[in-house]
């Protein structure tokens, strides 16, 4: 009799475990659905608001010609700055012309004043050659003014109206860049 009760108890316990598993799976599935829903809603809202405002740049970004720029409010090292930009679908600022440099430095003066801002420029440790993050070379007029005395990896930053260089592991603000959305009108 006792053995029978014990067997029934074990069967009930097994059933309970299976139900808990099923509930856990359901909760996970529900969470996943909610997450997907949140994404869909966010995308719809983003699409609707950009269609309504036909804004080429996201909120808190600055537009100049075909580019949108974001000036960070936090400090980070060069590599983390790049990752922060990537999360927003952008990369660190890549300055292609003197006109773009003038726009950036002019905007920074208005926003924050004379601080250091990482850009997507770094120096090859062996050759000492400067390269933008996409592998292209900076134009001669857009090379950092001073060579950093650091034995570590060296990266480029903007300060006032100059391009300078520093150890990539120092903390600075940073500027992200992405392409502005073209208006379909």
């Amino acid at each position: 009799k006792l053995l029978q009760v014990s067997t029934i108890a074990m069967q009930q316990q097994e059933k309970l475990i299976q139900q808990e598993r099923a509930l856990l799976n359901f909760t996970e599935w529900k969470r996943s659905c909610a997450l997907q829903m949140k994404y869909c809603q966010a995308f719809m809202q983003n699409s609707l608001s950009s269609a309504h405002n036909s804004s080429p740049c996201p909120n808190n970004w600055i537009q100049n010609r075909e580019s949108c720029y974001y000036v960070s409010e936090i400090w980070s090292i060069w590599h983390t700055s790049q990752e922060n930009c990537l999360k927003e679908g952008s990369t660190l600022l890549q300055i292609e012309s003197k006109e773009e440099m003038d726009f950036i430095t002019g905007s920074l003066r208005k926003i924050k004043g004379s601080y250091d801002y990482w850009v997507g420029l770094s120096q090859d440790g062996h050759s000492g050659r400067w390269l933008w993050q996409d592998g292209s070379s900076p134009s001669p007029g857009l090379l950092p003014a001073e060579r950093s005395q650091s034995a570590n990896q060296v990266c480029g930053y903007v300060k006032s109206n100059s391009l300078l260089s520093s150890n990539c592991s120092t903390w600075k603000y940073f500027i992200c860049e992405k392409y502005a959305l073209r208006s379909s009108v």
Partner: nanobody, 121 residues
């Protein structure tokens, strides 16, 4: 959710080449940027190369000029062409997908299982 599967790793001589592939499935529409990271034994995981959904590209200074990242949107695949490989490139290479930030949600990055790349001298 987004699932990532890497392939193409292996053993190669110094100066040689390898091409890594990362096949993505799931909610790929939610991704802002695709990337490759690597982790050598006893070191932190580091960004190697990334490509945004706009096609903007970023390389780590250590691989700039040697590695090339590309993406085939139709196949939902990201590639990393690695040339002039050095022993210091030896690491496990991970595919990464960064989702669009959604207000009120803390969704982290998506990661593949990793593929081993060994460069012998």
């Amino acid at each position: 959710q987004v699932q990532l599967q890497e392939s193409g790793g292996g053993l190669v001589q110094s100066g040689g080449s390898l091409r890594l592939s990362c096949a993505a499935s799931g909610s790929v529409f939610s991704i802002n940027a695709w990337g490759w990271y690597r982790q050598a034994p006893g070191k932190q995981r580091e960004l190697v190369a990334a490509i945004t959904n706009q096609g903007r590209i970023a390389y780590a200074p250590s691989v700039n000029g040697r590695f090339t990242i590309s993406r085939d949107s139709a196949k939902n695949t990201v590639y990393l062409q690695m040339n002039s490989l050095k022993p210091e490139d030896t690491a496990v290479y991970y595919c990464n997908a960064k989702p669009t930030p959604v207000y009120g949600s803390t969704v982290g990055d998506y990661w593949g299982q990793g593929t081993q790349v060994t460069v012998s001298s």
